[in-house]
């Protein structure tokens, strides 16, 4: 009489995470009497996956009704597959023994590989803002994918970047993998509206890569340029001095007027105008009563932008009987600020 053989026809099975894996196994004989068990791995540390005889295996169902007398199909289904389920599964026939059943014959094994999608890439930029011409680093991370092969690309405004380094961990065999990439980006003054994109392509994504983005508006700081100008007003004893704050980002800005070094007014940028490149302009006016001064006045526009050290621009106001226009304001976007007279 031919000896029982345990047949596992599939050398390998590939299943997407979340789906059900079918592991096939048939015996060639009903004899010897005894149960079938499924294990993951071989040797003393093997993990019991299913025992026909006893136990509770909520994720496992049998393909056939094992209580039927002539059943020789011991295939199983494992539901809700995760990358942790990857491994080689063995269908093992036991023969009844005293007091314990004895392993009789094992199948050749079926390797279960799990295809798991990478998580959505998360792009993070530097902790502190940087100014144009500086190089900043962005990182991109994605986790939980299998198999290990993966492609990562960086883009800035649709243009592919080349200065980046990528690592896939772990280096050896694992149930799932993670990717970590760092890209270097040189900032320009026009980058307020720019985006950095990390794109991950994997076999599980069927040609539709995942993308993570970072807005450079959260990374860049464009320092303002200052221009102080003076023009006459209708009242002969008053002079209008304007401080034009141009091309700054972000909006957080505080302006202080100094008169001969003494603080005369401090205000915070509120009603700003936005340029096409995403930077802002703002203008502050100071109305100076010339008659209150016998000597020339040094007016200083001091700006503290985004918590950085203050920058300033000064203007010497000549006190004379007939003040002349000493500069013109050509900025079309001026919105002005609170008008205050200094007496």
């Amino acid at each position: 009489e031919e000896e029982l053989q345990v047949i596992q026809p599939d050398k390998s099975v590939l299943v997407a995470a979340g789906e059900t894996a079918t592991l096939r196994c048939t015996a060639t004989s009903l004899i010897p009497v005894g149960p079938i068990q499924w294990f993951r791995g071989a040797g003393p540390g093997r993990e019991l996956i299913y025992n026909q005889k006893e136990g509770h295996f909520p994720r496992v169902t049998t393909v056939s009704d094992l209580t039927k007398r002539n059943n020789m199909d011991f295939s199983i289904r494992i539901g809700n597959i995760t990358p942790a389920d990857a491994g080689t599964y063995y269908c093992v026939k036991f023969r009844k023994g005293s007091p314990d059943d004895v392993e009789f014959k094992s199948g050749a094994g079926t390797e279960l590989s799990v295809r798991a999608k990478p998580s959505a890439p998360v792009v993070s930029g530097p902790a502190a803002r940087a100014t144009p011409q500086h190089t900043v680093s962005f990182t991109c991370e994605s986790h939980g994918f299998s198999p290990r092969d993966i492609t990562l690309k960086w883009f800035k405004n649709g243009n592919e970047l080349s200065d980046f380094q990528t690592n896939v961990d772990p280096v050896g065999e694992s149930v799932s993998y993670s990717i970590h990439s760092t890209a270097k980006v040189v900032l320009t003054r026009e980058d307020v509206h720019s985006q950095v994109i990390c794109e991950v392509a994997h076999v599980t994504l069927q040609g539709d890569p995942l993308r993570g983005t970072a807005n450079l508006s959260e990374t860049i700081r464009v320092p303002p340029t200052l221009e102080v100008t003076q023009q006459p007003v209708r009242a002969e004893n008053q002079v209008n001095v304007t401080c034009q704050v141009r091309k700054f980002y972000p909006q957080r800005l505080q302006l202080t007027w100094l008169e001969n070094g003494n603080v005369s007014r401090t205000e915070t940028a509120s009603t700003v105008t936005e340029n096409k490149d995403g930077t802002y302009n703002w203008m502050s006016w100071l109305l100076v009563n010339v008659s209150a001064h016998r000597d020339d006045v040094k007016l200083t526009c001091q700006v503290e932008h985004d918590g950085q050290p203050a920058v300033s621009k000064s203007h010497d106001l000549k006190v004379s009987a007939h003040p002349k226009e000493q500069g013109s304001n050509t900025a079309a976007e001026n919105t002005g600020s609170n008008e205050r007279n200094i007496y």
Epitope: E1, E2, L4, S29, L30, I31, P32, V33, G34, P35, Q52, K53, E54, D65, L66, T67, K68, R69, N70, R95, K96, D101
Partner: antibody
């Protein structure tokens, strides 16, 4: 007619061994699964051991209470099935019935098991384990 | 494990059903009129009846529950009824028995 005659019962001492024999007639013995069922005083039926028609030690099965102490065997030429029970205990006391299944099991086909398909019983032999 | 009711009762001539539940595909039903006496097979393989058993005894199985039906119960039917099956380890199991009382 199918007849099953048990023998070998009687008074046994604890720790000893007994050998029960069932002599079958009236059917093609080697085509059928055979088994032993017992009944302790005041208790229900209990499966003791079974042997499939395929024969050999690879086609035997034992109840939990006797597993490791019992051996069932068959002699198709003599149409007998034997139950050997070692290390006897007081709880082995009872009537031991020989049972014939309605079919047999070969390597590739099983018409019957035992407890779900007994179609003939012997009259039983009484075993008393006592010192 | 096999579960069956400890006792059932029926009036003479009535139909009585005894159930047995367990994790198996096949069940047998055995009648024992006195403790220690040889059991009699009423039904094997769920619904097969030996030729010497009256047709008022019938067996059926639905899902994991087997049922022995006795139609037109007679006084002589008073006995203990056992169901038997095989567990997943090919070991025979018998229920604890159901005592039928005919009123």
């Amino acid at each position: 007619a199918v007849t099953l005659d048990e023998s070998g019962g009687g008074l046994q001492t604890p720790g000893g061994a007994l050998s029960l024999v069932c002599k079958a007639s009236g059917f093609t013995f080697n085509s059928y699964n055979m088994g032993w069922v017992r009944q302790a005083p005041g208790k229900g039926l209990e499966f003791v051991a079974g042997i499939y028609s395929a024969g050999g030690d690879t086609s035997t099965t034992y109840g939990a209470a006797v597993n490791g102490r019992a051996t069932i065997s068959r002699d198709n030429g003599q149409s007998t099935v034997r139950l050997q029970l070692n290390n006897l205990r007081a709880e082995d006391t009872g009537i031991y019935f020989c049972a014939k299944a309605a079919g047999g099991c070969t390597a590739h086909n099983c018409d019957a098991y035992i407890a779900d398909s007994i179609d003939a019983w012997g009259h039983g032999t009484e075993v008393i384990v006592s010192s | 494990a096999v579960t069956q009711p400890a006792s059932v009762s029926a009036n003479l001539g009535e139909t009585v059903k005894i159930t047995c539940s367990g994790d198996s595909s096949y069940y047998g039903w055995y009648q024992q009129k006195a403790p220690g006496s040889a059991p009699v097979t009423l039904i094997y393989d769920n619904d097969k009846r030996p030729s010497n058993i009256p047709s008022r005894f019938s067996g059926s199985k639905s899902g994991s529950t087997a049922t022995l039906t006795i139609t037109g119960v007679q006084a002589d039917d008073e006995a203990v009824y056992y169901c038997g099956n095989e567990d997943m380890n090919y070991v025979g199991i018998f229920g604890a028995g159901t005592t039928l009382t005919v009123l």
